[in-house]
């Protein structure tokens, strides 16, 4: 489903490149915001979000934060620009196309992110950095 | 500059089958879901199928007519989208499109013909 | 799968004119509409989303309207460049349709 407040399409007068020069198109991503989650202890996760959008810009980036406090477990999933913090932290991952959770410092919770390039990237969510691999035995375990 | 270029159309018998090509450049064509969208003569605009990203499994979808007979592949290495049409029927008559999936970018188009 | 029903098929109008294309939808589609143009030869070319909102580039004259399951493709002011097929698409769901298409001819 493409929420229609965030369904774009390529804007051809302002074209956006990476850093190789190639062209970037909008990303389709998860975008649910926060939801309640029941992914804990696990090496990777799905999002659990029915609804996939079309970001609003083409330098927009998909993003996942996953929470933990002594109430709840949630996970955010939206679409952000990378030149711009999100919780007050750098995407530094934002070219990796697949959404590596990297553990950042918040008081009085647990607190995960993750930002990658590829469509619908932050449906599956890795938090095991043995799954950050090539090996496609590894990828046939988290497409399962 | 971005290009689609289709490629692998011409004209095969009921019941054959045919691989169609998508060359794409300027853009990062792993990090993409693509369709394939096609048009038979003086007809309508009908989607086919697409293909999902490598990294989240390359799933694919297809429309009611397609399904079982057509297979939808990508080879990121190569930044080329396939369709494989087999058991081709007369109605699979068309110009085909390589699309960027759900956004507004498409190939010139290839033509199949299905006749005898 | 979600029908998509353009009305009319054709019309025959004037440069000036002011045109309606309809598109109505088997079932609610929230504002999951899009319009496309379509020349002979050529590849389709976006002109709303949403429903409503004009595609980068797109003239002013064209507008969209509607959601649910009816919607409106407005030409307020037809241009010679406007003569060519328009059709609807919903985004709704998988599969994404199109209506049969609406083919603008010149009067």
């Known amino acids: 489903t493409i929420p229609p407040h965030v369904q774009k399409s390529v804007n051809n007068d302002m074209i956006v490149t990476d850093n190789n020069g190639a062209v970037k198109f909008p990303q389709l991503c998860k975008f649910c915001d926060v939801r309640f989650s029941t992914c804990d202890n696990q090496k990777s996760c799905m999002s659990n979000c029915s609804i996939t959008s079309i970001c609003e810009k083409p330098q927009e980036v998909c993003v996942a934060v996953w929470r933990k406090n002594d109430e709840n477990i949630t996970l955010e999933t939206v679409c952000h620009d990378p030149k711009l913090p999100y919780h007050d932290f750098i995407l530094e991952d934002a070219a990796s196309p697949k959404c590596i959770m990297k553990e950042k410092k918040k008081p009085g919770e647990t607190f995960f992110m993750c930002s990658c390039s590829s469509d619908e990237c932050n449906d599956n969510i890795i938090f095991s950095e043995e799954y950050n691999t090539s090996n496609p035995d590894l990828l046939l375990v988290i497409f399962q | 500059q971005v290009q689609l270029v289709e490629s692998g159309g011409g004209l095969v018998e009921p019941g054959g089958s045919l691989r169609l090509s998508c060359a794409a450049s300027g853009f990062t064509f792993s990090n993409y879901w693509m369709s394939w969208v096609r048009q038979a003569p003086g007809k309508g605009l009908e989607w086919v199928g697409r293909i999902k990203t490598t990294y989240s499994g390359g799933a694919t979808d297809f429309a009611a007519p397609v399904k079982g007979r057509f297979t939808i592949s990508r080879d990121d290495s190569k930044n080329t989208l396939y369709l494989q049409m087999n058991s081709l029927k007369t109605e699979d008559t068309a110009v085909y499109y390589c699309?960027?999936?759900?956004?507004?970018?498409w190939g010139q188009g290839t033509l199949v013909t299905v006749s005898s | 799968d979600i029908q998509m029903t353009q009305s009319p098929s054709s019309l025959s109008a004037s440069v000036g004119d002011r045109v309606t294309i309809t598109c109505r939808a088997s079932?609610?589609?929230?504002?999951?509409l899009n319009w496309y143009q379509q020349k002979p030869g050529k590849a389709p070319k976006l002109l709303i989303y949403?429903?409503?909102s004009l595609q980068s580039g797109v003239p002013s004259r064209f507008s969209g309207s509607g959601s649910g399951t009816d919607f409106t493709l407005t030409i307020s002011s037809l241009q010679p460049e406007d003569f060519a097929t328009y059709y609807c698409?919903?985004?709704?769901?998988?599969?994404?349709?199109f209506g049969q298409g609406t083919k603008v001819e010149i009067k």
């Open positions: 079932q609610s589609i929230s504002s999951y």
């Open positions: 698409q919903q985004s709704y769901s998988t599969p994404p349709t």
């Open positions: 699309t960027l999936d759900l956004r507004d970018y």
């Open positions: 949403a429903a409503s």
